[in-house]
């Protein structure tokens, strides 16, 4: 029977004739930076080439006994998970291994840096097809390691890393915290986060998605035909490296941004029990378990978007938080969130020639998050239109006035300290969906984009009684680009996108002691691209 992990990443209604890239990843080379490996294991022999690269520290302890099978254990297993004949994800992928971890599984930042440089030089000397680099290791936060990952990613290499097994915020570790790297957490057969002794998978906003990482059968370095189960975020990352190899083999021209968006899009959504994560991390941690796409066709026409959370601003009065999209992505909307509800909104602003999303803390607030909605929108021309606070009691409003530009997101930002309470509701005039409205004391920012065939519509869901959470989702075929709250009398903590659903959170009714705070309305902006749809039809 198929191992649970391979079954899990195989989408429902999967048909062999429908998704078969040439030999399951054969056009892709996967570099593995790990321990030494047993390359003559029949699961991987002929598929893994051991490079002459080795940069490892001495093993600790005077009585350490270097046993080949133990030295090779971690790397051999991971090579098997990526491309093993029987238990591998991408059975056609070829691999190259670099030894950066010693027999105790320890390495150094410098060793890993030199390994990454070795790959970069190899790529320059002998350019091949798409490259995936698997980094199944985690150490303390390292600015220099993250920078090296960024350089390699910008050279067109896909880097996949383990989130770490410390039951902690992945942003505290490297290379997991590098934004350019695809960071993978681990789940088990029940789609629950993996517990490893007293610890377990890392979590948080630096994790891109989860993948099977408990009781994973793979090649064992004990013998040429041995298999063993291992667990951890390394195994999870190996699954995603395999999936990436499959996707890149089917579509070799995919950019890192496109690949990441597809990994997110085709993941199983909302299957992880978030109660395992610390309460403050639940909203930040993606509820996504990696899966292979059901088909190589039909993905190209979709408008792909993902949600990017900033780091926490910190509690100081003027603190801000910034969320950024990847270089190839467009920022289509910006929202903010504060657990205390004390915030001064958010705005989209230019920084280094690119739009970023900045959220503002308020006096007495415990800090804010900025939430960017980052999308793949080829040939897009986006700009931000701002309306300063209005004098009129009707409130502030702004719309996209340029011909062919459509509204993709609304943000509001205010200077007054606490704009969430005791303000009269503002009603959107009917028949004017292409505009943003807000409090008269607030500046309103509209994200307006022109792209071939782009069309958007506004969808609202209002609840008259106070609710902790109000949601509105885009229907099939449409992608959520913007998520905000219509100004009302209820105290809104913020708004954010979860997959294709806009979530507006309000202060817990039980803590306010009042049940007459009024309506909460979630506003979703849903878009689609007719141009992308037509382009994909022409290709087939």
């Amino acid at each position: 029977s198929i191992p649970w992990n391979l079954e899990r990443i195989t989408p429902p209604r999967y048909r062999a004739d429908e998704y078969q890239p040439p030999d399951g990843g054969s056009l892709v080379e996967v570099y593995l930076l790990d321990t030494s490996i047993q390359s003559d294991h029949r699961e991987i022999e002929g598929r893994v080439m051991v490079t002459d690269f080795e940069n490892v520290p001495e093993e600790d302890g005077t009585r350490f006994h270097r046993q080949a099978s133990k030295c090779d254990s971690h790397g051999t297993h991971l090579a098997g998970v990526v491309s093993g004949r029987d238990a591998g994800v991408a059975k056609g992928a070829s691999m190259r291994s670099l030894r950066v971890l010693n027999c105790q599984g320890k390495g150094t930042v410098s060793g890993t840096l030199i390994g990454l440089e070795f790959i970069r030089k190899s790529q320059l000397v002998q350019p091949v097809g798409p490259l995936v680099v698997l980094l199944p290791l985690a150490g303390g936060y390292s600015r220099v390691l993250n920078a090296a990952c960024q350089r390699l990613a910008r050279a067109g290499v896909v880097l996949v890393t383990a989130a770490g097994n410390f039951r902690d915020d992945a942003c505290l570790y490297s290379p997991a915290s590098a934004p350019e790297v695809i960071t993978v957490g681990a789940t088990n057969a029940q789609d629950q986060p993996v517990t490893l002794g007293t610890l377990g998978t890392n979590f948080g906003r630096c994790v891109d998605l989860f993948a099977p990482g408990e009781d994973i059968i793979g090649a064992s370095s004990d013998c040429s035909t041995c298999f063993v189960s291992q667990s951890g975020t390394s195994q999870a990352a190996a699954h995603v490296a395999g999936i990436a190899a499959m996707m890149l083999s089917a579509e070799p021209e995919l950019t890192l941004a496109e690949l990441r968006q597809r990994l997110i899009h085709f993941s199983a959504k909302d299957v992880i029990n978030e109660a395992w994560f610390p309460e403050d991390q639940r909203v930040l941690t993606p509820n996504l378990v990696a899966a292979l796409p059901p088909s190589t066709h039909g993905a190209g026409w979709q408008l792909f978007c993902r949600t990017v959370w900033s780091a926490h601003s910190g509690p100081t009065r003027m603190a801000t938080a910034v969320a950024r999209c990847a270089p190839d992505e467009e920022l289509l909307s910006c929202s903010s969130f504060s657990r205390s509800g004390k915030r001064r909104g958010e705005r989209m602003e230019a920084q280094g020639g690119k739009l970023v999303c900045r959220a503002h803390n308020a006096f007495g607030g415990e800090g804010v998050y900025a939430i960017a909605r980052c999308c793949l929108l080829p040939q897009a021309n986006c700009s931000v239109h701002t309306a300063p606070p209005a004098e009129a009691s009707m409130g502030t409003r702004v719309h996209c006035h340029q011909q062919g530009h459509v509204l993709t997101g609304c943000s509001s930002h205010w200077e007054v300290e606490d704009l969430g309470t005791h303000k009269p509701p503002v009603l959107r005039p009917r028949g004017q969906p292409n505009q943003c409205v807000g409090h008269r004391e607030a500046s309103i920012h509209a994200s307006c984009c022109h792209a071939p065939g782009l069309e958007c519509k506004v969808k609202e869901h209002g609840i008259p009684a106070p609710q902790e959470q109000v949601t509105v989702a885009c229907e099939e075929g449409w992608t959520l680009t913007g998520c905000s709250a219509l100004p009302g009398t209820s105290h809104v903590l913020g708004a954010y996108a979860v997959d294709n659903t806009c979530v507006v959170r309000s202060r817990d009714v039980s803590t306010t002691g009042s049940t007459s705070e009024g309506a909460v309305t979630a506003v979703a902006i849903c878009c689609r691209s007719r141009h992308l749809a037509q382009a994909s039809q022409e290709l087939q």
């Epitope: 030999d23 029949r42 699961e43 022999e45 002929g46 598929r47 099978s69 254990s73 093993g84 004949r85 029987d86 238990a87 059975k91 056609g92 059968i217 064992s220 004990d222 013998c223 040429s224 035909t225 041995c226 298999f227 063993v228 189960s229």
Partner: antibody, heavy 119, light 113 residues
């Protein structure tokens, strides 16, 4: 049902070439290894080598390396064992058997092909 | 290569009696990472291909009568037929499948006394 069906008995002269076959059915042929095992008259079992039809990976016993060639055609779910120049000492019963990666024992065997090499 | 040695070479047992075959490997076929012995037992009747009886040293293949049992670990293994039946007359082979080349014992012939 799962089975391996081997080609019929062969009588050959020394120096001739030969290719015998083993066709799998009732299972995913590319997901299992096929081993070839020799049994000389009145003797025990000797493992010759294997192939993984999924990617044609082969592994030979040192005793048979260079003496025989193992191949497969996954499009027709068939594995082959061939000799370019037979010797009288190649007279034996040849079995194919399948095994799985993490279940590396041979659970299904072909009925055998008797090869007789005689001048 | 791992050398597999069976004893005895042949064995004559009365119907209904116990038959015991031993197999020794020149090196351990027990692996600590998964705690499995990479050893199988096969039965070959005259004019037939071998048939899998036992794998992982002690796991009976489905459809094999429960009078067949395997035991042992590391380098020493035993196949036991608890109550010999007429249809059990055959040659029995042990096999290690952990290391290449895969190797078989020389075989033990079981007959009825």
């Amino acid at each position: 049902q799962v089975q391996l069906v081997q080609s019929g008995a062969e009588v050959k002269k020394p120096g001739e070439s030969l290719k015998i076959s083993c066709k799998g059915s009732g299972y995913s042929f590319t997901d299992y290894y096929i081993s070839w095992v020799r049994q000389m008259p009145g003797k025990g079992l000797e493992w010759m080598g294997l192939i993984y039809p999924g990617d044609s990976y082969t592994r030979y016993s040192p005793n048979f390396q260079g003496q025989v060639t193992i191949s497969a055609d996954k499009s027709i779910s068939t594995a082959y064992l061939q000799w370019s120049s037979l010797k009288a000492s190649d007279t034996a019963m040849y079995y194919c058997a399948r095994d799985h990666g993490y279940r590396p024992y041979s659970d299904i065997w072909g009925q055998g092909t008797l090869v007789t090499v005689s001048s | 290569d791992i050398v597999m040695t069976q004893s005895p070479d042949s064995l004559a047992v009365s119907l209904g009696e116990r038959a015991t075959i031993n197999c020794r490997s020149s090196q351990s076929v027990l692996y600590s990472s998964n705690n499995k012995n990479y050893l199988a037992w096969y039965q070959q009747k005259p004019g037939q291909p071998p048939k899998l009886l036992i794998y992982w040293a002690s796991t009976r293949e489905s459809g094999v009568p429960d009078r067949f049992s395997g035991s042992g670990s590391g380098t020493d293994f035993t196949l036991t037929i608890s109550s010999l039946q007429a249809e059990d007359v055959a040659v029995y082979y042990c096999q290690q499948y952990s290391s290449f080349p895969i190797t078989f014992g020389q075989g033990t012939k079981v007959e009825i006394k």
